[in-house]
Interface confidence: medium
């Protein structure tokens, strides 16, 4: 099989406050074995925004039911955007291990937020 | 109920081919992830190979990779192998299963056909 | 190749008897393990998945436990249905998804 790739078609999106935010991400292959997870920022700071394995995140829901093999899409959509959401989002593939093990990420997505329209 | 029925299953001779089906009822065919796994005489359970749920993604098993072809038609609920090259010990009940995962990359089967015969000797 | 061992290759259990029935691996998969069922003739049923999780319609006398590298399927009071073949398999990671030797049940 060919090496996974995590792509991120999206360079930048800008999206109006209060409105939501889809961030595109796919995958082409289900090998290594492993989840996806979302962060903002890059490095040991980086926020992490979804987890596909477990976790609660409110505002976070997926464009397509990624938690069954229905595709190897991981599209999100963050609701009720603010300035405090702008930032580079990654989309990273993790391989299954103990604990599990970063393989890959995509090259971002820039969030802009503009002002809500009045 | 879920249903799979596999056919085409049958005697050839090493090197020829052979064509196996699978009917799928009782559930959204589409969503989920298909596989063959086969059991020769007398003999434990292997998998030969899985397709994912659009057909863009296909995984083997060493022993038929380059030999066998796994496809799916969603529009007619059906899982095939295409089997060439046949040898003696791809002799086996072959078994259509359903995944039944919960996470994409995990799998496992919680459903299978009966199974149909394929017997590869001179 | 994640390899997975069952022991013992047969077991003899009188009806009414409990059966402990082993899955070892060759390396750590979590609990990432299914468990299932074949009689002779017959497909292959799913018993357990997630190394202790119940099937849909799986009655409570099966259970399964461990992580890691080893794994118990228990059945607390055989039936005379349960004398069957039973095998382990892991999906911690694929290709290949491998399944173990197989442990026979049968009445003693």
């Known amino acids: 099989e060919e090496e996974l790739q995590v792509i991120q078609p999206d360079k930048s999106v800008s999206v109006a406050a209060g409105e939501s935010a889809i961030l595109h991400c796919t995958v082409t292959s289900l090998i290594p074995v492993g989840p996806i997870q979302w962060f903002r920022g890059a490095g040991p700071a980086r926020e992490l925004i979804y987890n596909q394995k477990e976790g609660h995140f409110p505002r976070v829901t997926t464009v397509s039911e990624s938690t069954k093999r229905e595709n190897m899409d991981f599209s999100i959509s963050i609701s009720n955007i603010t300035p405090a959401d702008a930032g580079t989002y990654y989309c990273v593939k993790f391989r299954k291990g103990s604990p599990d093990t970063e393989f890959k990420s995509g090259a971002g997505t820039e969030l802009s937020v503009r002002a809500k329209p009045s | 109920d879920v249903q799979l029925v596999e056919s085409g299953g049958g005697v050839v001779r090493p090197g020829e081919s052979l064509r196996l089906s699978c009917a799928a009822s009782g559930f959204t065919f589409s969503n989920y992830a298909m596989s063959w796994v086969r059991q020769a005489p007398g003999e434990g359970l292997e998998w030969v190979s899985l397709i994912t749920t659009n057909g863009d993604g296909a995984y083997y098993a060493d022993s038929v990779k380059g030999r066998f072809t796994i496809s799916r038609d969603n529009s007619k609920n059906t899982l095939y192998l295409q089997m060439n090259s046949l040898r003696a010990e791809d002799t086996a009940i072959y078994y259509c299963a359903k995944d039944g995962a919960a996470h994409y990359y995990d799998i496992f089967f919680d459903y299978w056909g009966l199974g149909t015969p394929v017997t590869v000797s001179s | 190749e994640i390899v997975l061992t069952q022991s013992p290759g047969t077991l003899s259990v009188s009806p009414g008897e409990r059966a402990t029935l082993s899955c070892r691996a060759s390396?750590?998969?979590?609990?990432?393990l299914a468990w299932y069922q074949q009689k002779l003739g017959q497909a292959p049923r799913l018993l357990i998945y997630?190394?202790?999780t119940r099937a849909t319609d799986i009655p409570d006398r099966f259970s399964g436990s461990g992580s890691g590298t080893e794994f118990t399927l228990t059945i607390s009071s055989l039936q005379s249905e349960d004398f069957a073949v039973y095998y382990c398999?892991?999906?911690?990671?694929?290709?290949?998804?491998?399944f173990g030797g197989g442990t026979k049940v049968e009445i003693k």
């Open positions: 390396q750590n998969v979590r609990s990432d």
């Open positions: 398999q892991h999906y911690y990671d694929w290709p290949p998804v491998t």
């Open positions: 997630d190394a202790n």
